[in-house]
């Protein structure tokens, strides 16, 4: 009887009430792998969560999270919050990020702003909430009379052609 | 899964205090609130306040301080509803109620049994 | 404190009609995100509080879909389409905007 049930594919059940006949899984539940005696209910995604791949009779349905969250957990179990740039989560709520701290993304911690003097440069242009200080070059190379083999070509976005 | 399991029914003096608990699995303790309602027999529900495990802040609701204080033993994943000077008015069904902070931090999702005290001489 | 009332206090419905029930906040539960932190319970007969929907209308994991949260601001509004046995017990309002948290009186739905 036994080998009866394994010759059951995914997407059915071995159904004890029948003669152990294959039978295909009731409507709202799956089965991901042959010779199964009952059909797993299939997630729903409600609330805070949507449907990012609908549940079939072989596959559990998918989720994602809605606009405004993002997942968390393995297979998108949980669902957080996100906040602005310029804040993080903490346990009561989204809070701005403390003065020398930055967090660009809607996710995540804020993080200290780059110390721009441990690696011998100078600030170019000063942190905020949302992002970190831009370093330039160290204030020796500022002097007035430190030599440079080469001046640095003026700052351009990536793909703009110089003036 | 998540599961709150709470101590049993406690008939107490007036005047003596309680302590009721709420062992915790299923879930990280430390980083969700742990909220505690009170339900007076054929009466509705009342926020009693909150903590925070993982440093034990706390919000309470002022018609509750002094009376009641929230703790948590983070090692054995059990929060603890302690109220004090008991007297006829505190006899009820005691919940604790944790609080998902991965989706907001202002709901209920899973509940205890509950808690009946029961205060009388 | 925030003032819930719920209406009506008792509902009688016979299985397969909807059912409606009111809650109003004595202030906007509107929170400073932008975001409103209305939940509804449902508490059957000798068992705890269940939540049902949270944020005004996001209905939770295995809440039926005939379950409808709707409202803004300090009215609020849970729609049962059509009332099933299961569905009998006491349903509350809860927000949590607001210091302290207060839940409405209670709504008991009864099965006629």
């Known amino acids: 009887l036994q080998d009866l049930c394994s010759n059951c594919p995914a997407g059915t059940f071995c159904d004890n009430n029948r003669s152990q006949i294959c039978s295909p899984c009731p409507p709202n539940s799956f089965s991901s792998a042959g010779g199964q005696r009952t059909c797993d209910i299939c997630r729903q995604c409600k609330g805070v969560f949507k449907t990012r791949k609908e549940c079939s009779s072989t596959s559990n349905a998918e989720c994602d999270c809605i606009s405004g969250y993002h997942c968390l957990g393995a297979e998108c179990s949980m669902c957080e919050q996100d906040c602005k740039q310029g804040q993080e989560l903490t346990k009561k709520g989204c809070k701005d990020c403390c003065f020398g701290t930055f967090n660009d993304q809607k996710r995540g911690i804020c993080r200290p702003w780059t110390n721009c003097s441990l690696d011998g440069k100078s600030v170019l242009v000063n942190g905020t909430k949302e992002r970190d200080v831009v370093c330039g070059p160290s204030p020796a190379d500022l002097s007035p009379g430190a030599s440079s083999a080469t001046p640095p070509a003026p700052a351009r976005e990536p793909g703009h052609s110089p003036q | 899964q998540v599961q709150l399991q709470q101590s049993g029914p406690e008939l107490v003096k007036p005047g003596a205090s309680v302590k009721i608990s709420c062992k915790t699995s299923g879930y990280a303790f430390s980083t969700s609130w742990m909220n505690w309602v009170k339900q007076r027999p054929g009466q509705g529900l009342e926020w009693i306040g909150r903590i925070y495990p993982g440093d034990g802040d706390t919000d309470y609701n002022g018609r509750f301080k002094g009376k009641a204080t929230l703790t948590a033993d983070k090692s054995s994943s059990t929060a603890y509803l302690q109220l004090s000077s008991l007297t006829s008015v505190d006899s009820a069904v005691y919940f604790c109620a944790r609080l998902d902070g991965y989706y907001e931090v202002f709901y209920f999702d899973y509940w205890g049994q509950g808690t009946t005290l029961t205060v009388s001489s | 404190d925030v003032v819930m009332t719920q209406t009506p206090l008792t509902l009688s419905v016979t299985i397969g009609q909807p059912a409606s029930i009111s809650c109003k906040s004595s202030?906007?539960?509107?929170?400073?995100?932008?975001?409103?932190?209305l939940n509804w319970l449902l508490q059957r007969p000798g068992q705890s509080p269940k939540r049902l929907i949270y944020l005004v209308s996001k209905l939770d994991s295995g809440v039926p879909d005939r379950f409808t949260g709707s409202g803004s601001g300090t009215d609020f509004t849970l729609k049962i389409s059509r009332v099933e046995a299961e569905d009998l017990g006491i349903y509350y309002c809860?927000?949590?905007?607001?210091?302290?948290?207060?839940f409405g009186g209670g709504t008991k739905l009864e099965i006629k």
């Open positions: 809860f927000q949590g905007t607001h210091f302290p948290w207060t």
């Open positions: 202030q906007s539960l509107l929170y400073s995100n932008g975001k409103t932190y």
